[in-house]
């Protein structure tokens, strides 16, 4: 903590500008008015302060706002955000998506820090749920965000937010996570017509139960093998040969190349050889 000393004559800062980079730490403490700093936070980022100088500026803001910074200051923190601790951030009330974006930008391209995790947690709790706009923003900065959440956290995602999910956002999710997301997607897309519905639901199908796969098989969807291979084994096993043939359409020939891999292998073993022979692929049960 910086010792309290009087500001030398003529050094009182009338505004936040480049001249402050030549101030010693104690001069910054003595000569920069905290209220002025708060109103001119947007200028701090353009000035190449040292980490030690930033510590002093943070200290001044902490003194001015012991209960937590107002959003008008938070939005313009810029690189000063990197100086904040999770404890600091827990005092904040961030409600604007623009503020969230501004702070995520500071950390862009880096692994999520405990500070960012706390910020996101505070923001989502403040909003009451992980809404579509928030999810859109988070997955833009953190493509693996959804797949890094627990099933319990995913269960609080409202179906309306599923519209913000892109197929690549689900690439690394595991079956347990898809089990949670699939019913939400089904609900979100329920009013779409057959082919449009399939395009939207396709990346969530790793969580689909047997009855939904049976229903899809009646809709000429022509599921590709890559999607079929990601289906739950327990959901695929009860499907008949005719249902799989309808589900895959022209892609059914791809079963031969995958006959030793799950779920195809396990499904083949459940079928009658006579039924498999109707496919003409030489599959052996």
């Amino acid at each position: 903590e910086v010792e309290k000393t009087a500001c030398p004559s003529g050094k009182k800062a009338p505004e936040i500008d480049e001249s402050l980079i030549f101030y010693k730490k104690w001069e910054l403490e003595a000569c920069v008015d905290a209220a002025l700093l708060a109103t001119q936070m947007d200028r701090v980022n353009a000035i190449p302060f040292t980490y030690e100088q930033l510590d002093v500026l943070k200290h001044k803001l902490d003194e001015l706002y012991p209960q937590g910074y107002p959003e008008s200051v938070i939005q313009h923190l810029g690189y000063l955000f990197l100086k904040m601790s999770p404890e600091d951030i827990r005092k904040w009330n961030v409600t604007s998506l623009e503020t969230l974006k501004a702070l995520l930008e500071v950390n862009k391209g880096h692994e999520m820090s405990p500070q960012v995790a706390t910020l996101i947690d505070r923001f989502v709790k403040g909003r009451g749920q992980l809404d579509k706009d928030t999810l859109d923003t988070l997955t833009a900065f953190y493509p693996g965000y959804l797949c890094s959440l627990s099933p319990e956290e995913l269960s609080s995602v409202p179906p309306s937010s599923i519209w913000a999910v892109r197929p690549q956002d689900l690439d690394t999710c595991d079956p347990r996570q898809l089990d949670v997301l699939y019913p939400k997607a089904r609900l979100a897309f329920q009013n779409m017509n057959g082919s449009e519905y399939f395009v939207k639901i396709q990346s969530f199908l790793g969580g689909a139960p047997t009855e939904d796969l049976k229903a899809l098989s009646q809709q000429n969807v022509s599921m590709d093998l890559a999607t079929f291979m990601k289906l739950r084994t327990d959901a695929v096993l009860p499907l008949t040969v005719a249902e799989v043939q309808k589900l895959l359409g022209p892609h059914v020939e791809g079963l031969k190349a995958e006959e030793r891999h799950r779920p195809v292998r396990d499904w083949i073993l459940r079928q009658r050889q006579d039924d498999l022979d109707t496919l003409g692929l030489g599959l052996q049960g």
Partner: nanobody
């Protein structure tokens, strides 16, 4: 640079047990989910188990449920997989996977062979 290293693989008899470990070094700071996958020659990687970022909740593939236990020590960035009642079909290379909001990191794998 993040590095993921598995250890603990080996040869074990059917019905036996084995404990795999996964260590993560580097700046994995927050919100990471850790998983085990396995792969047999010519096959795709198959999900085995996950332990999630918050609260340490877990998930298991049906084929290992009740036999395998996944756990983690977040302070040490370690995860382990206790494998009990092993069967010949558990023979595979086991891979540790660390999922962060930004990236997915894989280890090189450790061979587990279940044979009498």
């Amino acid at each position: 640079e993040v590095q993921v290293v598995e250890s603990g693989g080996g040869l074990v008899q059917p019905g036996g047990s084995l404990r795999l470990s996964c260590g993560v070094s580097g700046s994995i700071l927050a919100l990471n989910t850790m998983r085990w996958y396995r792969q047999t020659p010519g096959n795709q990687r198959e999900w085995v188990a996950s332990i999630y970022s918050s609260g340490g909740s877990t998930g298991y593939a049906d084929s290992v449920k009740g036999r395998f236990i996944i756990s983690r020590d977040s302070a040490k960035n370690m995860m382990s997989l206790q494998m009990n009642s092993l069967k010949s079909e558990d023979t595979a290379v086991y891979y540790c996977n660390v999922q962060t909001p930004l990236n997915v990191y894989w280890g090189q794998g450790t061979q587990v062979t279940v044979s009498s």
